[in-house]
């Protein structure tokens, strides 16, 4: 028999907590409370520890950091004597992906918890439509992602597997293209990137609309729509209309959702419809001219999703002008 | 180096009071817990009370109750224990040890050599 | 309070050998365990700590395992020199020993 008060104490098991780099985390760890508190957090990597905090007579003790947690950890000091010993992480590298023990003693009791640090990135990723030369390409491409992803294409909905994959970045994060060679095609396709430690998806769909053959001084109506299936209401998405022509990309109109503002770089270009439910993002483009015929590409983006819908807009000398020839 | 000094063996009349002494060296004194811990002659070991010398705060073992008062002398480096109203159960050796906590370890890992203390009239 | 149970007394061993001293926790002590030598005549000495984590300067011939309630202290390659009395000792509250295992060499 001791002299003390009786306190239940849970054990806790090794957490796995999994943070963003560049963000701030919180490595969790409780403790009975008790007076004469110790701290002291650890980080083990195959052949070393190294002190990352440590907290006694009191205070915090950082003789002994390890420099490589200067100014990035510190611990809730007016909640120690309540029994956390949790550990606030700012700033996350991937370096910093491990294991990391705190070792706490008061008067009464000694105790470890262990918590296993993972780090992931996962920069929204784009679906890019290129041409080069008489070639299409579908490019999937994420500047920053870790670990790997799981890249997957589907062509009409059915799994495909040849694809060019590109990648940079030998330890992480990693900077991933993956080429789709779609020329001749009027396939629908969709490409999805699994970051699976973060539990996060991105895909990208890309239709191509039948052609539509105008007159000039006509006008035509591109059509765009966002799918229900992709974007939960309260989603924050963009929508942008662009010209492509001989490979370079000339953006015709932009909206935001965030701030329901739109931007025309084009005078002929219109919504064709008020953008009062959001999900119709449909175009006109007025007064068609010869050099119109070409390439038009909507392009809805949000975090997990980017629609790409392609049209091809043919323009035919009218009557009037043919004759006048 | 790091040591800790008892003083030597003592031999006492029952019912006398009994100061011994534990001089630490070769390292900061007041970031190290001193723990006294009894061991008797069929070898079993048990913790009688331990000081924390930076506040000066004791945690005691229930079954030592009333039998040991510690103190520190923080100047000196010297942890002493005061056993009172001795009887013939108290003869055996007892032994301060360092319990570390600065480096994680929360063990001893430095032990005094012992009093040996016999009480007899 | 938590009582440490040592149950072999006295095991006996050849030079070269293996063994292995058991302990037992009446409850769940994580991994707060420390194992202890005390030579014939001689202070105890820290040989284990946090159940596995051997201290300075000792031989890897020693290896301390497990958690919770059961703790196995190893000697591989059993020496003379290793001729003692050897303690578990739980900090997961307070402090309390076992009651010591004696290693006699045949």
């Known amino acids: 028999i001791f002299l003390s008060a009786f306190f239940t104490y849970v054990p806790m098991n090794e957490q796995i907590i999994i943070g963003r780099l560049g963000e701030d985390i919180i490595l969790p760890s409780s403790f009975e409370r008790g007076s004469e508190v110790v701290i002291h957090w650890k980080y083990q990597d195959s052949y070393n520890s190294y002190n990352v905090h440590s907290y006694y007579k009191g205070s915090g003790r950082l003789e002994s950091q390890d420099t490589r947690y200067a100014n990035r950890t510190s611990l809730f000091y007016n909640e120690i004597q309540n029994g956390n010993a949790s550990l606030f992480f700012r700033r996350l590298s991937l370096l910093d992906e491990g294991i990391y023990t705190c070792y706490v003693g008061t008067a009464i009791q000694a105790i470890t918890n262990k918590v296993v640090l993972k780090v992931g990135v996962f920069l929204t990723p784009m679906m890019k439509y290129e041409k080069r030369n008489t070639n299409s390409f579908l490019i999937c491409n994420v500047l920053s992602v870790y670990p790997r992803p799981i890249i997957t294409w589907k062509m009409d909905n059915t799994p495909i597997s040849e694809n060019n994959m590109q990648e940079t970045g030998s330890l992480g994060p990693f900077s991933i293209n993956s080429t789709l060679n779609i020329t001749g095609s009027n396939s629908s396709y969709e490409c999805t990137i699994e970051n699976s430690l973060l539990k996060q998806t991105w895909t990208g769909r890309w239709t191509m609309k039948d052609g539509l053959h105008k007159m000039q001084s006509e006008h035509v109506s591109l059509s765009c729509e966002l799918v229900n299936d992709y974007f939960s209401p309260n989603q924050d998405f963009k929508v942008t209309w662009s010209r492509m022509e001989s490979g370079i990309s000339s953006i015709l109109a932009y909206y935001l959702s965030s701030s329901q503002n739109t931007t025309f770089y084009e005078s002929r270009f219109s919504w064709n419809k008020e953008l009062k439910n959001q999900s119709d993002f449909s175009m006109n483009l007025t007064d068609l001219s010869l050099s119109d015929s070409g390439e038009y590409l909507c392009n809805i983006s949000s975090d997990e999703y980017t629609l790409l819908t392609i049209h091809t807009v043919h323009v035919e000398p009218s009557q009037e002008t043919a004759s006048d020839n | 180096e790091i040591q800790l000094q008892q003083t030597g063996p003592e031999l006492v009349k029952p019912g006398a009071s009994l100061r011994i002494s534990c001089k630490a060296s070769?390292?900061?004194?007041?970031?190290?817990?001193i723990v006294w811990v009894k061991q008797n002659q069929g070898k079993n070991l048990d913790w009688i009370e331990k000081?924390?010398?930076?506040?000066?705060?004791?945690t005691y073992n229930l079954r030592f109750e009333d039998k040991a008062t510690l103190t520190v002398n923080k100047s000196s480096t010297t942890a002493y224990m005061q056993l009172n109203s001795l009887t013939s159960e108290d003869s055996a050796v007892y032994y301060c040890?360092?319990?570390?906590?600065?480096?994680?370890?929360?063990?001893?890992?430095?032990w005094g050599q012992g009093t040996s203390i016999t009480v007899s009239s | 309070d938590i009582v440490m149970t040592q149950s072999h007394k006295v095991m006996s061993t050849s030079v070269g050998d293996r063994v292995s001293i058991i302990c037992k926790a009446s409850q769940d002590v994580g991994t707060a365990v420390a194992w202890y030598q005390q030579k014939p005549g001689q202070s105890p000495k820290l040989l284990i700590y946090w159940a596995s984590t051997r201290h300075t300067g000792v031989p890897d011939r020693f290896t301390g395992s497990g958690s919770g309630t059961d703790f196995i202290l190893t000697i591989t390659n059993v020496q003379s020199e290793n001729l003692a009395n050897y303690f578990c000792q739980q900090y997961k509250r307070y402090y309390t020993f076992g009651g010591g295992t004696k290693l006699e060499i045949k």
């Open positions: 000081i924390n010398p930076y506040y000066g705060t004791t």
């Open positions: 070769g390292y900061s004194f007041t970031d190290y817990i």
């Open positions: 040890a360092r319990w570390d906590y600065v480096s994680t370890l929360f063990a001893m890992d430095y």
